[in-house]
Amino acid sequence: IRAEKAMVDGSWLDLAKRSKLEAQPFAHLTINATDIPSGSHKVSLSSWYHDRGWGKISNMTFSNGKLIVNQDGFYYLYANICFRHHETSGDLATEYLQLMVYVTKTSIKIPSSHTLMKGGSTKYWSGNSEFHFYSINVGGFFKLRSGEEISIEVSNPSLLDPDQDATYFGAFKVRDID
Amino acid sequence: IRAEKAMVDGSWLDLAKRSKLEAQPFAHLTINATDIPSGSHKVSLSSWYHDRGWGKISNMTFSNGKLIVNQDGFYYLYANICFRHHETSGDLATEYLQLMVYVTKTSIKIPSSHTLMKGGSTKYWSGNSEFHFYSINVGGFFKLRSGEEISIEVSNPSLLDPDQDATYFGAFKVRDID
Amino acid sequence: IRAEKAMVDGSWLDLAKRSKLEAQPFAHLTINATDIPSGSHKVSLSSWYHDRGWGKISNMTFSNGKLIVNQDGFYYLYANICFRHHETSGDLATEYLQLMVYVTKTSIKIPSSHTLMKGGSTKYWSGNSEFHFYSINVGGFFKLRSGEEISIEVSNPSLLDPDQDATYFGAFKVRDID
């Protein structure tokens, strides 16, 4: 019986470890600066790195600019978006800017899109200063179902900071759904 | 056999509980205001509390101003940095400020330092107002190896808000590395 | 013995799954816009949704405008607060605003209230622009005891953005206390 108990313990450790890892999807996606759209209106950002630098993904899928949930659960979602302008980049079309991020969830089954989180600020980026910068951070805890998609929309995408430490979003599973 | 099963269950509950606790390092470090450096360029903040007020640490080490990882894993890292100026605080030399935070990872094995997250804003703090305030929050999910170090760099450290609820950073382990 | 082992494994999977769920309280509360207080001073926000839209709660209690902890543990707490003003809403009393959030913990046993996190910014919302917006995000890792209460205080509540994606706070348990 002792040997059997040891075997139970052993198999359990493996099983617990394995199931724990399988139960914890995550992603951290960093902006792909080679493909940032232009314009000042709200646009969806579709180009992100998931496999270089700080970018990584596990038990989730990145496809067509969207982060796809493969496993039901409650997830913590976050985004950090940085905007910047230097006078050497040329004049801004306007000094009054609305710098915003929207983290949206799309359900394929019921074709609909909903904003989970938003953040940002109106800014006055005057010509008296040669450099301007602003960052937004949002985060929250959401129930996500397999097949649902997370995407990022921003205003003024041409002002995005292309560094991987500046503009990114991510998710990690915290717990199962009851 | 039933008694044995009960024993297995009992030992398992203990083992699961114990291993779960051991597997979840965390830290929440609050600014030590008695030792804030001066300067206007990016400086590293080395004085933090880990054992008073909201400051706490477990299965990680705080040494030489850096948060040291003791256990490989994926961690959620975060920082909240507040800057403020009151007309009684001193003679502010410029209205145009770049208030920034950089969360950096240093690998000892391969001596190199990389910025994981950055945030902040350029601000115009005019003399027309007697008080100014601004906070930055950043957060993200990163793979950290044992021995790696996390540190915080800021611009304009003399403007930091010294309250424990204002200027802090932290980390908690979410899952093992596969 | 093999049958017994299978039974052990089976009961263990159920037990582990069940105890894991029971051990992970969470809440995501979104602003109830029908009951936002007026004024420009610091006020406690007591009206939140916990059961509609993105609002949800499990193994925690929402009562009298406070999020009550039912289970000791280390929790990640977060808040996202958005302020906005459009010229059609009427003139602002002042163009110089202090837009702030305070996440506070109240202990019933020892009647005392402490600020865990604060964030925000002073803003100059000039009449030259027809629309103004600003968001704050804070987050941190804290030890919470059963019976303790989390509440949100803000300045200028009449400027709050009433959308569920804009103004919310939440918590999720990460680990037990040793």
Partner: antibody, heavy 122, light 107 residues
Framework: EVQLVESGGGLVKSGGSLKLSCAAS????????MSWVRQTPEKRLEWVAG????????YYPDTVKGRFTISRDNARNTLFLQMSSLRSEDTAMYYC???????????????WGTGTTVTVSS | DIVMTQSHKFMSTSVGDRVSITCKAS??????IAWYQQKPGQSPNLLIY???YRYTGVPDRFTGSGSGTDFTFTISSVQAEDLAVYYC?????????FGGGTKLEIK
């Protein structure tokens, strides 16, 4: 070449007024806080006024507060010091000085003008 | 106001000598001290800031040290062109105050 050139000094009666100017060139004037520092006949250096880069903050020691006013015109790259209710102890060489970049609360001076002399007679 | 005291009004030295000038603050100024050189008939020139940082273009024979209330400015090997008055200034808190100056004379 970075240069500061003061003007406007001269002889003035006690209780009188005088306006000093400082023309800046060779650097982006609007990016720097500026000060006036005087040197007494005994060769002591005294800081008398400071102004932030954008001009919305002005600072003075108690000895001149209410009598001296520092201002700037960033469009014309010029610094001013309006002095009134002058006293004999205000007699000095007045230097225009650029505050070096550094901690936002700390002022030291990396570029000085050649100075202009102010003599207050009783 | 913080009072800065340079106890030696004059110091005499020879070319090639090492010379140290001291400055004392009436209260703790951490490391917020600058040193200036003023040659005869000229304006002051910044040499050292934040107690020990050499300003751009300043020869490395000029060094500064100290923290708190006691500060030292050193010329490791005096040159003839170093004939000047040397002033300390605290940049810790307003009003910004200067020492009375130390005149370095070459024998």
């Amino acid at each position: 070449e970075v240069q500061l050139v003061e003007s406007g000094g001269g002889l003035v009666k006690s209780g009188g007024s005088l306006k000093l100017s400082c023309a800046a060139s060779g650097f982006t004037f609007r990016n720097y806080a500026m000060s006036w520092v005087r040197q007494t006949p005994e060769k002591r250096l005294e800081w008398v006024a400071g102004i932030s880069s954008g001009g919305t903050y002005t600072y003075y020691p108690d000895t001149v507060k209410g009598r001296f006013t520092i201002s700037r015109d960033n469009a014309r790259n010029t610094l001013f010091l309006q002095m009134s209710s002058l006293r004999s102890e205000d007699t000095a060489m007045y230097y225009c000085a650029r505050r070096d970049y550094g901690d936002v609360y700390e002022w030291y001076f990396d570029v000085w003008g050649t100075g202009t002399t102010v003599t207050v007679s009783s | 106001d913080i009072v800065m005291t340079q106890s030696h009004k004059f110091m005499s030295t020879s070319v090639g000598d090492r010379v140290s000038i001291t400055c004392k603050a009436s209260q703790d100024v951490r490391t917020s001290i600058a040193w200036y050189q003023q040659k005869p008939g000229q304006s002051p020139n910044l040499l050292i800031y934040s107690a020990s940082y050499r300003y751009t273009g300043v020869p490395d024979r000029f060094t500064g040290s100290g923290s708190g209330t006691d500060f030292t400015f050193t010329i490791s090997s005096v040159q003839a062109e170093d004939l000047a008055v040397y002033y300390c200034q605290q940049h810790y808190s307003s009003p910004w105050t200067f020492g009375g100056g130390t005149k370095l004379e070459i024998k």
